[in-house]
């Protein structure tokens, strides 16, 4: 007996071939001997089966001795043995219909779990293997679970169902809802305008929810809510904003915040959370602000940074075009009695400059100038 695998919702063609290459009488029946369809001359006739409105054949193939049964919009319960009667012969075809669905929404928050459920006909014993967009393979029986979804899990999951050495492939599009970056760091000189951007790693037609940015300043003992906002159909509206600092927010996506001035008291870490409508849980993005200040007080030239810096970052003071006078893995460096000229304060990581502030030291009889 021939075995054919079908997918729920799909269309399947069950073939039946006669030795004579011409249109002759044929009938398709199910295992209960109920007629599905057949022909009377060149007319298509249908029986009283439950497939009635979903069963069809191709008249143009009859003249070639082919008498297919085409079943549209397959259901799991269409799984059955179908019998084609032609030329006093019976051809049996076993149809097994499978369905694979994500038993939650296919739009999931980063860190959530994905469960895929296989619907299969009674008596079948299929195995399932799924391949994620990043090439990770998972195997299972009736259900497959993936915990802690990551951004790279967004895309088409390809699942292969194996039964009777035959296979059928399902493709399921999964969207992992997350920010493009889990964390970002902004380096600014004191007084500069600060731009924070929170691009999303997904696109959906309508995006509605609400969000908040909590800020933990390095100098503060507790965190504080800097801004709360609403998102309606990708339009951003500010609900509440602190007076200090007075943040500004862009009205369109990607989420965009502007801090008018980088000041040492603002240096620290923030956590932007976004709660999406009809979703449990929230999206998070951490943002860090490092602020640099270079000053000269009497005979002391000082460079300081505030905010979350890694211990491997190097802070240096150097006279332009000369070797560094001082270079330390600390948050403040200074030079006593600096010689006149343009001094550079550099914050660098393995030789790559992250932040630079210049200060002009004038000969001792005049006051310093900051460009």
């Amino acid at each position: 007996k021939k075995v054919v695998l079908g997918k729920k919702g799909d269309t399947v063609e069950l073939t039946c071939t006669a030795s004579q290459k011409k249109s002759i009488q044929f009938h398709w029946k199910n295992s209960n001997q109920i007629k599905i369809l057949g022909n009377q001359g060149s007319f298509l006739t249908k029986g009283p089966s439950k497939l009635n409105d979903r069963a069809d054949s191709r008249r143009s193939l009859w003249d070639q001795g082919n008498f297919p049964l085409i079943i549209k919009n397959l259901k799991i319960e269409d799984s059955d043995t179908y019998i084609c009667e032609v030329e006093d012969q019976k051809e049996e075809v076993q149809l097994l219909v499978f369905g694979l669905t994500a038993n939650s929404d296919t739009h999931l928050l980063q860190g959530q779990s994905l469960t895929l459920t296989l619907e299969s006909p009674p008596g079948s014993s299929p195995s399932v293997q799924c391949r994620s967009p990043r090439g990770k393979n998972i195997q299972g029986g009736k259900t497959l679970s993936v915990s802690q979804l990551e951004l790279q899990d967004s895309g088409t999951w390809t699942c292969t169902v194996l039964q009777n050495q035959k296979k059928v492939e399902f493709k399921i599009d999964i969207v992992v809802l997350a920010f493009q970056k889990a964390s970002s760091i902004v380096y600014k000189k004191e007084g500069e305008q600060v731009e924070f951007s929170f691009p999303l790693a997904f696109t959906v037609e309508k995006l509605t929810g609400s969000g908040e940015l909590w800020w933990q300043a390095e100098r503060a003992s507790s965190s504080k809510s800097w801004i709360t906002f609403d998102l309606k159909n990708k339009e951003v509206s500010v609900k509440r904003v602190t007076q200090d600092p007075k943040l500004q927010m862009g009205k369109k996506l990607p989420l965009h915040l502007t801090l008018p001035q980088a000041l040492p008291q603002y240096a620290g870490s923030g956590n932007l959370t976004l709660a999406l409508e009809a979703k449990t849980g929230k999206l998070h993005q951490e943002v860090n602000l490092v602020v640099m200040r270079a000053t000269q007080l009497q005979k002391n030239l000082t460079c300081e940074v505030w905010g979350p810096t890694s211990p491997k970052l190097m802070l240096s003071l150097k006279l332009e075009n000369k070797e560094a006078k001082v270079s330390k893995r600390e948050k403040a460096v200074w030079v006593l009695n600096p010689e006149a000229g343009m001094w550079q304060c550099l914050l660098s990581d393995s030789g790559q400059v992250l932040l630079e502030s210049n200060i002009k030291v004038l000969p001792t009889w005049s006051t310093p100038v900051q460009p």
């Epitope: 079908g6 997918k7 919702g9 799909d10 269309t11 399947v12 063609e13 001359g41 060149s42 007319f43 298509l44 069809d56 191709r58 008249r59 143009s60 003249d63 085409i70 079943i71 549209k72």
Partner: antibody, heavy 115, light 107 residues
Framework: QVQLQQWGAGLLKPSETLSLTCAVY????????WSWIRQSPGKGLEWIGE???????NYNPSLKSRVTISVDTSKNQFSLKLSSVTAADTAVYYC?????????WGQGTLVTVSS | DIQMTQSPSSVSASVGDRVTITCRAS??????LAWYQQKPGKAPKLLIY???SFQSGVPSRFSGSGSGTDFTLTISSLQTEDFATYYC?????????FGQGTRLEIK
């Protein structure tokens, strides 16, 4: 809802090979036949040929010697190649889904053959 | 090949009119006939299949009848959106063939 999207070169010189591809989005790719039809002012609507998921083909005898229809099931796409084109092959070419009737059509591609 | 002949090749009518288009096959095709509507610059759209069955979404003012060699498409009460070209197609045998079309114009 099934959608058919087609593309390919629109301007050819005589004796060149016409090449068009049609992608099927949504709906079932299996169980159906996938056809190419052309429409020219002189000949009206003319069925070129068809293919199914298994690669089984049927061609219009009037064009059979010049036509090749192929399928790529991994991409839900099928393609038409028509060799040795002449000005008589200038037409709008459509891809379509069929069991007995053409119930879904592509947007059409105007192919002009001119020296 | 089965030849499909439509008549008339064009017809002028007014909104609200009843219009009948006929299609004749050069040999018997049982009920293996479909009707399509085509508007300028667009692909044909299936209206009627198996001679008299409605494709989903097609208004009930369209109806089809016939069997064997003679078939008709009737529009009971013309609407402005019905002014288009109509084609018949046989699915009885390869190669599938179409009628030459009937252009329905506003009077």
């Amino acid at each position: 809802q099934v959608q058919l999207q087609q593309w390919g070169a629109g301007l050819l010189k005589p004796s060149e090979t016409l090449s068009l591809t049609c992608a099927v989005y949504g709906g079932s790719f299996s169980g159906y036949y996938w056809s190419w039809i052309r429409q020219s002012p002189g000949k009206g609507l003319e069925w070129i040929g068809e293919i199914n998921q298994s690669g089984s083909t049927n061609y219009n005898p009037s064009l059979k010697s010049r036509v090749t229809i192929s399928v790529d099931t991994s991409k839900n796409q099928f393609s038409l190649k028509l060799s040795s084109v002449t000005a008589a092959d200038t037409a709008v070419y459509y891809c379509a889904r069929v069991i007995n009737w053409f119930d879904s059509w592509g947007q059409g591609t105007l192919v002009t053959v001119s020296s | 090949d089965i030849q499909m002949t439509q008549s008339p090749s064009s017809v002028s009518a007014s909104v609200g009119d009843r219009v009948t288009i006929t299609c004749r096959a050069s040999q018997g095709i049982s009920s293996w006939l479909a009707w399509y509507q085509q508007k300028p610059g667009k692909a044909p759209k299936l209206l009627i299949y198996a001679a008299s069955s409605f494709q989903s979404g097609v208004p009930s003012r369209f109806s089809g009848s016939g069997s064997g060699t003679d078939f008709t498409l009737t529009i009971s009460s013309l609407q402005t959106e019905d002014f288009a070209t109509y084609y018949c197609q046989q699915a009885n045998s390869f190669p599938y063939t179409f009628g030459q079309g009937t252009r329905l114009e506003i009077k």
